[in-house]
């Protein structure tokens, strides 16, 4: 007679990443009896919510419920019904909501309130919706990639092959690029973190980590583009903005009211003699790059060294995983290979940006024009941010690994967030029996 398969003793968790441009739902799964082991949690599903980020629902909060329905229903299908009630659901909102809160705490609260009410209607164990800090976003991204790379444990990992040559236990730094903010997080080498705001101390699996992190609000790729447009329109002689960051032949009309809607463009705001202006692409990488560099103030530094805007940055150390939009943009541009030098990346960007818009549209017929039109800017911005902002060089470029997934789990802050909130990262190295929760971070 055949043996009957024993029911799988597994647990699930759900995290919603409410970003500035969209919301994604992630479902994680792990063996119940191995909760304290490193590397056992993995992603089983990602569901991208159709529509913009939740901050865009400020004038139509009644639509939030419908907006979240498809992905929450997908979670209902993926997770066995018997597990629904004990599956935690967390929603973390990032820089898009931080910006909304800067404009109006009341409006941000209203959006989160409706989100919470919508998510409470599902049969899961809803644990709340909150705006996470930039520091948390950086820290959880760092935890995620190092957890997935098996950096927190000497023990054999649950998967056989780990990418990115990770025999040693030196952690990877994390570079995260979103639509509204960007984070840099790493363990500096024997360096005091001169700015207390940028210092984090963790004890994970019996080891202490002194981590540097900073989140640059308004320096995500979308807000950086708004900043650049607001800066450049100041010196335009009329309502035509000849823009080197868009392909030759590209044209787009922009409302001045949209340009000044975000707090990120406040420093460039001025009274313009027109309500609209037209972007006309001229496709010149060098000029685009030069324009972007003007967004980084490098003339002031109250520390031994800075990234930009007077923010402390220790000397770079170790390898870095660059994920989220760093990966999506570079993947589209076919520049994620470890073998591509910084000089080659620059050469390819020059060629890409110089391609006529009509030619680009034909070559990438399946890509939405709104996204397609911005890859020249985004790619140039990534280079500018890494090279000028964070001081990577031609020599150290090889230490940047553009990562989408690690062993099937997306690189990003969500997994680290859930691991922390479900107490699955012990402070001490677990023995054969799980430790008491009092020792967890």
């Amino acid at each position: 007679t055949q043996n009957k398969a024993l029911p799988e003793n597994v647990k699930y968790g759900i995290v919603l990443d409410a970003g500035s441009s969209h919301t994604s739902l992630y479902i994680y799964k792990w063996p119940a009896e191995k909760e304290n082991d490193t590397g056992v949690v993995h992603q089983v599903e990602e569901c991208r919510v159709k529509g913009p980020g939740i901050s865009k629902f400020v004038q139509k909060v009644n639509e939030i419920g419908i907006y979240l329905t498809d992905c929450m229903e997908r979670a209902r299908e993926v997770i066995p019904r018997s597990q629904h009630q004990e599956t935690p659901v967390y929603l973390g909102a990032t820089a898009g909501m931080r910006l909304l809160r800067m404009e109006s705490e009341e409006l941000a609260d209203r959006v989160l309130d409706v989100v919470e009410r919508s998510l409470s209607n599902y049969p899961f164990d809803f644990q709340g919706a909150r705006i996470i800090t930039g520091q948390e976003e950086g820290a959880y991204g760092w935890i995620t990639i190092n957890y997935l790379l098996g950096k927190f444990s000497q023990k054999t990992r649950w998967f056989s092959i780990v990418p990115y040559e990770t025999n040693n236990q030196e952690t990877f730094g994390a570079l995260d690029l979103g639509g509204a903010s960007t984070q840099v997080t790493f363990v500096p080498q024997n360096q005091t973190i001169e700015s207390p705001d940028n210092a984090l101390q963790f004890r994970l699996y019996g080891k202490d980590y002194n981590v540097y992190t900073h989140s640059f609000l308004c320096y995500g790729k979308d807000q950086a583009l708004w900043q650049k447009l607001a800066k450049d329109i100041q010196v335009a002689s009329n309502e035509i903005l000849r823009d080197p960051c868009f392909h030759p032949g590209y044209k787009k009309v922009v409302n001045v009211s949209d340009l000044y809607k975000t707090p990120c463009t406040k420093r460039f705001e001025m009274t313009l003699p027109f309500q609209q202006f037209e972007i006309q692409g001229i496709g010149n990488y060098q000029q685009c790059h030069q324009s972007i560099l003007e967004l980084f103030n490098t003339s002031y530094c109250p520390y031994s060294q800075c990234a930009f805007n007077g923010i402390f940055l220790p000397p770079l150390q170790g390898d870095f995983g660059a994920f989220s939009a760093f990966y999506f943009v570079m993947k589209f541009l076919n520049l994620t290979s470890e073998k591509v030098s910084q000089e080659k990346v620059t050469e390819m960007m020059k060629k890409f940006c110089a391609q006529p818009w009509e030619e680009i549209k034909t070559s990438y017929a399946g890509v939405k024009e709104k996204y397609l039109s911005e890859y020249c800017f985004s790619g140039t911005y990534i280079l500018s941010l890494l090279l000028q902002g964070y001081h990577f060089t031609a020599d150290s470029w090889e230490h940047i690994h553009f990562i989408g997934k690690i062993q099937g789990s997306d690189a990003g802050w969500t997994l680290g967030y859930m691991l922390n909130l479900t107490n699955m990262i012990p402070a001490e190295q677990p023995l054969s029996t799980p430790l008491s929760h009092s020792t967890y971070v």
Epitope: Q189, C301, Q305, P315, Q317, Q388, H391, T393, A394, S396
Partner: antibody
Framework: SVEESGGRLVTPGTPLTLTCTVS????????MSWVRQAPGKGLEYIGI?????ITYYASWAKGRFTISKTSTTVDLIITSPTTEDTATYFC??????????????WGPGTLVTVSS | AYDMTQTPASVEVAVGGTVTINCQAS??????LAWYQQKPGQRPKLLIY???TLASGVSSRFKGSGSGTQFTLTISGVQCADAATYYC????????????FGGGTEVVVR
Amino acid sequence: SVEESGGRLVTPGTPLTLTCTVSGIDLSSNAMSWVRQAPGKGLEYIGIIRNNDITYYASWAKGRFTISKTSTTVDLIITSPTTEDTATYFCARGGGSYSIVFWNLWGPGTLVTVSS
Amino acid sequence: AYDMTQTPASVEVAVGGTVTINCQASERIYSNLAWYQQKPGQRPKLLIYYASTLASGVSSRFKGSGSGTQFTLTISGVQCADAATYYCQQGYSNNNVDNTFGGGTEVVVR
């Protein structure tokens, strides 16, 4: 501190090893460089050894020089000296592990004279 | 690649005056530039790094500026002790380059 030694008068073609001895510097955390200066001339970059033992050389120095290290010393081998290699040789510590933008601690230098 | 051209080769300045030294990179090096001071018979001394950050213990009379390919070192309120040769150095690419240093500028104080 950083101190160079091994500089002396050598005949052309005789290999010479210069040693940079460091104290209070963790060579697994810092990059080190060799720079030379011919009499009355400017500074000339030879090469570096990074914290992870990777070496970089100036284009003209490849094959002519070899840089290696132990836990407390960094060696520069001049494989086949010529009279043009007559110079003061400096060893310097980098301001980072691999993003080596500047050299913030220099030795006093050691003089190498190549003459027949 | 990444050749550094320093101008002028020599400059004379009166005590209390201001001197400006220029450094041009053949390719973009972002802010990865340092300035050094070297007096005869002495080792070089780091003055400025990341184009504009003053090294520890260096007088604020020394000011670095620029990014990309054009950089400037300005010494204001020149003193006799400033008589030296000044070098710029790029730290953007250390591999397979001819020289990371500029040719040097001799500052003569009268």
